[in-house]
């Protein structure tokens, strides 16, 4: 005997009270995949979290962050808070990069400005908390009389803002 | 280091009203969402209810309306309040941050109700 | 509400060994589960949020793993600090539920 619930669609159940007829999701459920016996919940987004897409009889709901939070794990799992560019996030919260280091993003943590001259080259702009130093070409392949926005400054490397 | 700090009566007698207090200190308090869990002497934790800064609420629907939470943002603190007590209400009240899980806790206080 | 089911309710491991405890949900929820730790007269611990996610400072011997209905706290190589009680939690659907724990203890 052929399995009718093999013929249910998502967005509906095989409902074995009703002789294998296909019933549709009670409201706040879902099926994805064809051929379920149930409906799954539909995940709420309360509390820290926001409902970014509603929940359909075929697709559960997806969550974002409150603002000035952003979603971390999977599937947004946990919200953390949103820094300013230029800070990271600790323990005692936001707190600004300190020199040498940078952070272009309202999340994750200062890392340290490029060392050009690792790559032979020379500081074509300064770093900031915001920003990462932008290396130029290196001193040797600046014909005589070029210039530059910003004379080579090796003795200053990584870069330098006024704090 | 953000910390929670709570504090509140620990013996109670049947029919009186426990007021427990969180402050929070370190880290944003406006944003997240502040919770308060229970746990019975030798046995596992109960989600109370939880509470934003602007006051917004929601409660485990077990307790039928007998919880009460307030929040006074200028001290970043907030607070419960379950009237009526019995007791089955007696154990470890802890508040803890809601981020999704909840990540930080407060060390917990035992409320007692006894006649 | 969606339950909780935690199992075994005790634990027994030997120091080095591996302890795997398990957590059942009585309905799908993703991976919107939370594993906590707690010791004798101390606030739980959270140690893995996302069903799988090590949470901040925890060491890399707990893993989580699991989704839907059935998930896993594994510590590979038990330390003598790691004997307490495991809480699961989900926080996919109000109102917010626990399992009942595990109680890990010395063989």
């Known amino acids: 005997l052929q399995d009718l619930c093999s013929n249910c669609p998502a967005g509906t159940f095989c409902d074995n009270n009703r002789s294998q007829i296909c019933s549709p999701c009670p409201p706040n459920s879902f099926s994805s995949a064809g051929g379920q016996r149930t409906c799954d919940i539909c995940r709420q987004c309360k509390g820290v979290f926001k409902t970014r897409k509603e929940c359909s009889s075929t697709s559960n709901a997806e969550c974002d962050c409150i603002s000035g939070y952003h979603c971390l794990g999977a599937e947004c799992s946990m919200c953390e808070q949103d820094c300013k560019q230029g800070q990271e996030l600790t323990k005692k919260g936001c707190k600004d990069c300190c020199f040498g280091t940078f952070n272009d993003q309202k999340r994750g943590i200062c890392r340290p400005w490029t060392n050009c001259s690792l790559d032979g080259k020379s500081v074509l702009v300064n770093g900031t908390k915001e920003r990462d130093v932008v290396c130029g070409p290196s001193p040797a392949d600046l014909s005589p009389g070029a210039s530059s926005a910003t004379p080579p400054a090796p003795a200053r490397e990584p870069g330098h803002s006024p704090q | 280091q953000v910390q929670l700090q709570q504090w509140g009566a620990g013996l109670l007698k049947p029919s009186e009203t426990l007021s427990l207090t969180c402050a929070v200190y370190?880290?944003?308090?406006?944003?997240?969402?502040w919770s308060w869990i229970r746990q019975p002497p030798g046995k596992g934790l109960e989600w109370i209810g939880e509470i934003n800064h602007s006051g917004s609420t929601d409660s485990n629907p077990s307790l039928k309306g007998r919880v009460t939470f307030s929040v006074d943002t200028s001290k970043n603190q907030f607070s419960l309040k379950l009237n009526s007590v019995t007791a089955a209400d007696t154990a470890v009240y802890y508040c803890a941050r809601l981020t999704g899980p909840f990540d930080y806790w407060g060390q917990g206080t035992l409320v007692t109700v006894s006649s | 509400e969606i339950v909780m089911t935690q199992s075994p309710a005790t634990l027994s491991v030997s120091p080095g060994e591996r302890a795997t405890l398990s957590c059942r949900a009585s309905?799908?929820?993703?991976?919107?589960l939370a594993w906590y730790q707690q010791k004798p007269g101390q606030a739980p611990r959270l140690l893995i949020y996302g069903a799988s996610t090590r949470a901040t400072g925890i060491p890399a011997r707990f893993s989580g793993s699991g989704s839907g209905t059935e998930f896993t706290l594994t510590i590979s190589s038990l330390q003598s600090e790691d004997f307490a009680v495991y809480y699961c939690?989900?926080?996919?659907?109000?109102?917010?539920?626990f399992g009942g724990g595990t109680k890990v203890e010395i063989k």
């Open positions: 939690q989900q926080y996919y659907n109000w109102p917010l539920t």
């Open positions: 309905q799908s929820i993703s991976s919107i």
């Open positions: 370190g880290g944003s308090f406006s944003g997240y969402y």
